[in-house]
Interface confidence: medium
Amino acid sequence: LYFSRDAYWEKLYVDQPAGTPLLYVHALRDAPEEVPSFRLGQHLYGTYRTRLHENNWICIQEDTGLLYLNRSLDRSSWEKLSGRNRGFPLLTVYLKVFLSPTSLREGECQWPGCARVYFSFFNTSFPACTSLKPRELCFPETRPSFRIRENRPPGTFHQFRLLPVQFLCPNISVAYRLLEGEGLPFRCAPDSLEVSTRWALDREQREKYELVAVCTVHAGAREEVVMVPFPVTVYDEDDSAPTFPAGVDTASAVVEFKRKEDTVVATLRVFDADVVPASGELVRRYTSTLLPGDTWTQQTFRVEHWPNETSVQANGSFVRATVHDYRLVLNRNLSISENRTMQLAVLVNDSDFQGPGAGVLLLHFNVSVLPVSLHLPSSYSLSVSRRARRFAQIGKVCVENCQAFSGINVQYELHSSGANCSTLGVVTSAEDTSGILFVNDTKALRRPKCAELHYMVVATNHQTSRQAQAQLLVTVEGLYVAEEAGCPLSCAVSKRRPECEECGGLGSPTGRCEWRQGDGKGITRNFSTCSPSTKTCPDGHCDVVETQDINICPQDCLRGSIVGGHEPGEPRGIKAGYGTCNCFPEEEKCFCEPEDIQDPLCDELCREQKLISEEDLGGEQKLISEEDLHHHHHH
């Protein structure tokens, strides 16, 4: 047995006479032989579930579910209840109604075996019948919605009449009907005004019925019509077996460059027309088992279950269903020397499915693990400026397919042929297994005899000791210019373009900082800032070279505070900033502030475009359009 609603609403007035019927509660059957029996909870509850008093006023007919006033609720009773409501005005009280047999202990009230009946209390007597509006004569203030389980016997789940109105205003005639399309499984009995299902419902055919209840009020010569929504939701049970969409029960996959733990190797999809078990229970009741194979397979792979709700079309309406993705996942990093082929089977069991048929499927995965060889190009050729500052990134080395690698460890080393000309360093990028070449020793750059730098690049996978080698020729270009005395270590400190471009800073390949002009669109990833190289900084990512010194790119790497409009980076730096962002690495602070536009007035020379002077932009000259100007003014 279950209630067709989890909550009911009615009004209560002071001194309403004993014997006044209030409302019916309805139970629906789970099995044809069940007979409902209703029981009221012992207490009345108020605001925040406060237990107010033993219920001495309202009774229920155990067999019909009719709630009625056993005795009148007078003003003194009401004041007594109000005094116990934690100081809140008592506007609503509620009772719990249970379906027997249930435990006699009055605990939590949870659907389906318990419903709450809420009474809106009015500290006045019942209004004169003539003063009631048609809406008040027809329907409760709170619109009901109904829950009906699929595949269950049909039954009565609602009664339209407002019983207190019918009892106290017998001269007012109220008629009801349901507006519904042809062939819908509901009927409203014209005599009893009971609404019932004609037959058992199938949620997989239709999940929601948006009906309309029509009430016609006759009071003397007056006839008025009131319409309200009458929604019915069909509740699911596990009556559908899992199936393979398009019959696909096998997936084939090759493991080559992606060898990292947690890599998804292949996915097979299972469809289930049901949406039960509910998400909390789903993984426990919808099981997947990797069938025993050899030890290596059991250690190397696991199956992950990813259920997702979806919508499917049935009889012209959409109903929810579930797709279950079963992912074959690497349980550990695979060595680049690993080379084998295997077949895996996964047993999926919808353990709640009762038939007909089986709730079990067998998934098949064919997997080939291929070995990876390390190859480098025969040689690299790069150039570097004599003015480059320490930590300037000048290029990358990368074994074949390194961009596609994950879970493959490659370490790069540089071996210099000229000991006094060892200018460069190399670090392995965690992102793409490439080696980033950077300036490590600026003194060597200045030596006249170091015009050409010769290196051997060695890439090693330490797990297997496999190696690859390549020649690297670096040409040193340009004339050395001494670093300016008044310049900061970090490009990022400069707040304005002229300050930025007159200095160099750590990480600068040209020996000069670069100004990145932002797009001016509020808090944006493309904020204005001063950088050693706009190719690498800021790009929302603190790379392996930038981690070597906070002065290189605090915009990406700072862990300190950011003042002003911004979105912080994860786990550090500035993901997005407002206007111009500059940073003070020693103080572990960045500032993001509006660009300094003050006086964008125009003369005859600049109708289409406006040249905003350095004064207006705080040290920067820039052509901006009417639209930009409006945007800056607006901000």
Epitope: L489, D616, G619
Partner: antibody
Framework: QVTLKESGPVLVKPTETLTLTCTVS??????????VSWIRQPPGKALEWLAH???????SYSTSLKSRLSISKDTSLSQVVLIMTNMDPVDTATYYC?????????????????WGHGTTVTVSS | AIQMTQSPASLSASVGDRVTITCRAS??????LGWYQQKPGKAPKLLIS???SLQSGVPSRFSGSGSGTDFTLTISSLQPEDFATYYC?????????FGQGTKVEIK
């Protein structure tokens, strides 16, 4: 030793144009973080910033005087020139030039660390 | 333009006194503020940059503090040579602006 010296006419007539020159020594006008500002001070009144030129030749001006001011520099002569048009008796003041540069140790922050002695300009018919 | 309001406009103090001058900006200027001392007939002299950084060669009795909109110049023990007019200057936003000055006189 860093020095700045202002030069220009002592007396100008109303509506005339004033040309002031600041000759610097001990640093280069093209060095990074080396800029020069002009500031004036009417008799018995507060200082007022007029204009600035950066080492990169970018310029900036006081909003209220922008239409009357022009600043420029000649790096080879180590000179910064301020031209002020349409002079008026209220422009009577001592005019200073000052070097604006960054301060050690981090070279983050700026200050006008060296000033000229100033040149007094009287506007009268 | 950002207004810089200095207070008091003038003050009388004795040698050895602790003197505090404040400067308030009409909007936040971070710490982009300098303090300058000017004696009659002389050019101003930079005392403090970045609100609190003492210029080399300036006696340690001078100190600066503050950030955002409120700034203070403190002379911990006034000396005879400190009687002068003091100005604050913001160079956070164009146009750069000076305060109206505080004249420190001998009581």
């Amino acid at each position: 030793q860093v020095t700045l010296k202002e030069s220009g006419p002592v007396l100008v007539k109303p509506t005339e144009t004033l040309t002031l020159t600041c000759t610097v020594s001990g640093f280069s006008l093209s060095s990074a973080r080396m800029g020069v500002s002009w500031i004036r001070q009417p008799p018995g009144k507060a200082l007022e910033w007029l204009a600035h030129i950066f080492s990169t030749d970018e310029k900036s001006y006081s909003t209220s005087l922008k239409s009357r001011l022009s600043i420029s520099k000649d790096t080879s002569l180590s000179q910064v020139v301020l031209i002020m048009t349409n002079m008026d008796p209220v422009d009577t003041a001592t005019y200073y030039c000052a070097r604006r540069t960054t301060m050690a140790p981090y070279y983050y922050y700026y200050g006008m660390d060296v000033w000229g002695h100033g040149t007094t300009v009287t506007v009268s018919s | 333009a950002i207004q810089m309001t200095q207070s008091p406009a003038s003050l009388s103090a004795s040698v050895g006194d602790r003197v505090t001058i404040t400067c308030r900006a009409s909007q936040g200027i971070r710490n982009d503020l300098g303090w300058y001392q000017q004696k009659p007939g002389k050019a101003p002299k930079l005392l403090i940059s970045a609100a609190s950084s003492l210029q080399s060669g300036v006696p340690s009795r001078f100190s600066g503090s503050g950030s955002g909109t409120d700034f203070t110049l403190t002379i911990s023990s006034l000396q005879p040579e400190d009687f002068a007019t003091y100005y604050c200057l913001q160079d956070y936003k164009y146009p750069w602006t000076f305060g109206q000055g505080t004249k420190v006189e001998i009581k």
